[in-house]
């Protein structure tokens, strides 16, 4: 059955090297003394990426990462011996890794630093205008940054600045083990969650935090924090990790009596990204590791894109589950985890719940409470024993969305882009693993828009050294995508519409919704443009149904690549066929001299297939003929290429290696007649190639040839130049082998 | 007005067992962490040991820990700890204190003392 | 050995101003960590005297002044008076193991 493709590989994979010689990717790799680009701060309007790292700060224009801006924001050297004397590593631990970059007004950003295991935080002047290109450190004003930024460089921190407060998930202490979600800066006195409470915060790792509304009334106004944490005991069997999503009122003041600067309004609850298996056991991934928040006209409801990976050794997967923000709004609204003592079950609590309900807001909308400090005291009693919610918040049609458990890396990252396209609007996603390599992936609605299927589109390699992509961020205004990682940062466009090939049935089939085929060229499809040639079909990718008039027209059509191989009778030989498409299944067929019929070749001993191609083994003169390699993909068949073989035997073979160099003697046989002198080396070395036992030794070979052919150049002024072209066609082809992409340029043709 | 009354000290044999009291009043009880700190004659201070509002978190000084217990009882108002396997270096005022964390950092501070009970250990 | 280095006495005569120190290392008061200082009447219980390195509980005279600096911490006595002899100590977290730390003690003798 060839009409299902490989639809869980990428249609396209680029190398690095790819990426760079298609200008696909431009790179900044990093400085000799820094490193860790990992806190990203966007700013569309001025057109700049800030990038906090190592003992440095960036200020990199969207256009181009190459130019670029950089602070020095390095640690004292008693700072740094301190640092040392704790027993502390000089160069992965004493240095100031920022972990905080964000927009503090018009005029300064607020930058928090690790500080050598001292946590510090300054402010950075931009200027009012992008063209007052100012980017200095206010050397003059350096704050505490304990319970801003953490001590530790490997520990994680989900940060908000928000009308001139800082809302911050970390560890405010030396050891790293006091977590808390900190507000600091503002003119109140600092705020945060219960301490030496394992059912506030459990050893959690924070993602990131959010400002989300929860009605026209901005003191409604809520902060969300994603993070992971250890189950608490009763909750699961075992040690686990729960994902988590938790609420505060950016109102919320404290409490009078109890609960005094700490939070009144905190409560959490779990995220599930579950795969329903067999006997009723999920395969659960719990490890969050990124989310990405989709505005799309209702800023209150967002749409919610977790990257979650599985926390088992043996067993690893990643996924991406889609939640939405009424199905976490009623989760909040749902009964709280309760139990009794220690080693009693969480169940949901039935008791009477105390008014104002705790995680409500003070505001006018719902109750008459102005401020945390008036909440009753059952209220601020019953808000610290009841953080947790009891019911979890499910993603979206119940699964995931993206499910990847065969492949040799995990997600880290997402950044998400809707696109319109002719048939509707389509979320792209741009994930990033700890390979270094971003995956860019479609979901596409099936039947209903809650049903929906993954497309892989690509995968790009975007570092030159396999290493964990840990920041990504998106310019919708550039259509260029930046990537952080420890080694440095990466910019790539939204887009290569034109690497998918050069047939409308190639875009077509490539379901990118940014692209679409203009007549002449896959390009970058605009709702704007009114043009009736546009044929793009990104909801069934049919190339049959949007190509059909185009598949004959020479003009745009690529008729397929032919070759001639000659093979060695009892020998074997090589035929080489791998599609631009990886989603493409390839089958060959064989049609025999002078014979019309053609009939698809099935694999045995005699012939083997691979990835790259077919291994004739020893050859046989029935074996001559015309071989047609073929790839369907969604229904559609492309011939890629036509190889005819001419197999020679022995004694043919025999009298030709027998032959001087110079072409003397009589020809017997009717190939050689043709041949120019210097053609009759080229085929006798050829011959000896081809029947090579050793196959690893033809670079070597070829070499030796190559070196012969230079020589008798200069030795022979007027020599044909056919040998070293036919050389050189095979020296191409030999490179070829690793380069699936951009092999050959094929039509389709239609079935 | 905030008061702490610690008792249950007294002399004990080196091996033997206390079990030390601390009655609050005056402050919501069960809304503050507490801690025994204890100093022996002549020396400075020392922590021993801390619990949270609910129990949830319990903390212990090396030199106490695997033989001291603390635990309280919010609805009596009453903090414990229990001391078990006592050693002569043992000897000293205990002291039960409450964390004020009245900082910015929340950085535990000890707000409010009791007068403190003598335990002494000597054969 | 306490964590956090005080000196053992320090002496001053009436209506003079007496400084304390308090030394700890970067795991302590280096870290960034609130200093808490405490007085201890002869034969009482300790008071608290000054938290968060400079704030006064109400009570407690403005002569009493706290500061921190890197590693560091001090008290300072102003105007010194009869009733403040009495022994000082300092106090920071360290969390965990132990939770806390506290200073040697220093004995104030006023002359």
């Known amino acids: 059955n060839y009409q299902n493709g490989k639809n869980n590989v990428p249609r396209l994979k680029l190398s690095y090297k790819e990426m760079l010689e298609s200008n696909n990717v431009i790179t900044f790799n990093g400085l000799a003394n820094s490193s860790s680009y990992h806190t990203f701060l966007l700013d569309e309007e001025r057109s700049r990426l800030y990038v906090g790292a190592k003992d440095h700060i960036f200020s990199f224009d969207l256009v181009n990462i190459k130019d670029f801006q950089k602070i020095v924001w390095p640690v004292s050297y008693t700072r740094r011996d301190e640092c040392k004397w704790a027993g502390k590593d000089i160069l992965k631990e004493c240095a100031n890794f920022i972990k905080v970059l964000k927009a503090y007004n018009q005029t300064h950003l607020y930058a928090c630093g690790t500080g050598a295991f001292h946590p510090i935080c300054t402010y950075i002047e931009i200027g009012h205008h992008p063209e007052d290109n100012i980017f200095k450190l206010e050397n003059s004003h350096f704050e505490n940054g304990r319970g801003k930024s953490p001590y530790d460089p490997k520990l994680l921190t989900a940060s908000l600045l928000i009308d001139g407060e800082l809302y911050s998930g970390t560890a405010a202490d030396f050891m790293g083990r006091d977590f808390a979600i900190f507000r600091t800066l503002g003119h109140h006195h600092p705020i945060r969650t219960e301490q030496h409470d394992s059912r506030w915060l459990n050893d959690p790792k924070f993602i990131s935090a959010h400002l989300i509304s929860e009605s026209d009334n901005p003191e409604d106004d809520k902060v969300y924090f994603f993070f992971r944490e250890n189950a608490i005991d009763g909750e699961h069997s075992g040690k686990a990790t729960h994902a988590r999503i938790g609420q505060i009122c950016k109102n919320d003041f404290g409490g009078h009596r109890s609960l005094v600067n700490k939070w009144t309004t905190f409560l959490k609850a779990r995220l599930i990204c579950s795969v329903p298996g067999p006997n009723g056991i999920d395969t659960h991934f719990d490890e969050l590791q990124d989310v990405f928040l989709m505005n799309f006209k209702d800023p209150k409801n967002p749409v919610v894109y977790g990257v979650f990976t599985t926390s088992s050794n043996i067993f690893k997967g990643s996924a991406v589950c889609m939640y939405s923000m009424s199905d976490v709004r009623r989760v909040f609204l749902g009964p709280y985890a309760h139990r009794d003592g220690p080693n009693y079950q969480w169940v949901p609590y039935q008791g009477r719940v105390p008014y104002p309900r705790p995680g409500t807001c003070p505001s006018k909308t719902f109750g008459g409470f102005d401020s945390t400090k008036d909440l009753p005291d059952d209220v601020i009693t019953f808000a610290r024993s009841h953080p947790a919610m009891y019911n979890p918040v499910f993603p979206m049609n119940n699964r995931p969305i993206v499910i990847k458990t065969d492949v040799n890396y995990q997600f880290t990252q997402i950044v998400v882009d809707r696109v319109d396209a002719e048939d509707g609007q389509y979320d792209v996603m741009f994930i990033g693993t700890d390979v270094g390599t971003v995956l860019k992936v479609v979901s596409i609605p099936k039947e209903t828009w809650y049903d929906l299927e993954e497309v892989l589109l690509e995968e790009m390699t975007v570092f030159r050294e396999p290493t964990a992509i840990s920041a990504m961020e998106l310019s919708t205004k550039q259509q260029q995508l930046y990537i952080g990682s420890t080694a440095g940062v990466a910019q790539l466009p939204l887009h290569r519409c034109d690497i998918y090939g050069k047939a409308c049935a190639e875009c077509c089939l490539a379901r990118d919704p940014y692209c679409a085929w203009d007549g002449s060229a896959c390009s970058r499809y605009f709702p704007t443009a009114k043009r009736r040639t546009r044929r793009q079909d990104i909801r069934n990718g049919d190339p049959l149904t949007h190509c059909s008039d185009l598949h004959h027209d020479n003009h745009h059509g690529h008729s397929p690549e032919e070759r001639i191989i000659y093979g060695v009778e009892n020998s074997s030989t090589f035929l080489e066929c791998s599609p631009k498409s990886q989603r493409a299944l390839v089958y060959w067929q064989f049609q025999r001299r002078n014979e019309e019929r053609k009939e698809e070749i099935r694999v045995d001993d005699h012939i083997i297939r691979t990835d790259q191609g077919l291994l004739l083994r020893s050859l046989q003169q029935k074996d001559s003929g015309n071989y047609l390699c073929h790839a369907v993909e969604h229904g559609f068949i492309q011939t890629l290429l036509k190889v005819t073989l001419e197999v020679i035997d022995t004694e043919h073979l025999e009298e030709l290696l027998h032959k001087d160099d110079d072409g003397d003697g009589s020809k017997t046989k009717e190939m050689s007649n043709s041949m120019t002198p210097s053609q009759k080396v080229w085929y006798r070395d050829f011959m000896q190639l081809i029947n090579h036992p050793n196959l690893n030794t033809m670079d070597e070979f070829c070499e030796q040839v190559w070196k012969r052919d230079r020589k008798q150049r200069r030795q022979r002024p007027g020599h044909t130049p056919g040998n070293s072209n036919k050389w050189k066609h095979l020296q191409e082809n030999k490179k070829g082998r690793n380069r699936r992409t951009h092999e050959f340029e094929r039509a389709p043709r239609s079935v | 007005e905030v008061q702490l009354l610690e008792s249950g000290g007294g002399l004990v044999q080196p091996g033997g067992s206390l079990r030390l009291s601390c009655a609050a009043s005056?402050?919501?009880?069960?809304?503050?962490?507490m801690n025994w700190v204890r100093q022996a004659p002549g020396k400075g201070l020392e922590w021993v040991s801390g619990?949270?509002?609910?129990?949830?978190?319990?903390d212990y000084a090396d030199s106490v820990k695997g033989r001291f217990t603390i635990s309280r009882d919010n609805s009596k108002n009453t903090l414990y700890l229990q001391m078990n396997s006592l050693r002569a270096e043992d000897t000293a005022v205990y002291y039960c204190?409450?964390?004020?964390?009245?900082?910015?950092?929340?950085?535990?501070?000890?707000?409010?003392w009791g007068q403190g009970t003598l335990v002494t250990v000597s054969s | 050995q306490s964590v956090l280095t005080q000196p053992p006495s320090v002496s001053g005569a009436p209506g003079q101003r007496v400084t304390i120190s308090c030394t700890g290392s970067?795991?302590?008061?280096?870290?960034?960590?609130?200093v808490h200082w405490y007085q201890q009447l002869p034969g009482t219980a300790p008071k608290l005297l000054i938290y968060?390195?400079?704030n006064r509980p109400s009570g407690v005279p403005d002569r009493f002044s706290g500061s921190k600096s890197g590693t560091s911490a001090s008290l300072a006595i102003t105007g010194l008076q009869a009733e403040d002899e009495a022994d000082y100590y300092c106090?920071?977290?360290?969390?965990?193991?132990?939770?806390?730390?506290f200073g040697g003690g220093t004995k104030l003798t006023v002359l």
């Open positions: 204190a409450r964390s004020g964390y009245s900082s910015s950092w929340f950085d535990p501070d000890f707000d409010y």
């Open positions: 005056g402050f919501d009880f069960s809304s503050y962490e």
């Open positions: 619990i949270s509002w609910n129990s949830g978190w319990i």
């Open positions: 970067s795991s302590n008061i280096g870290a960034g960590y609130d």
């Open positions: 968060g390195n400079s």
């Open positions: 106090q920071s977290y360290a969390g965990p193991n132990p939770y806390v730390v």
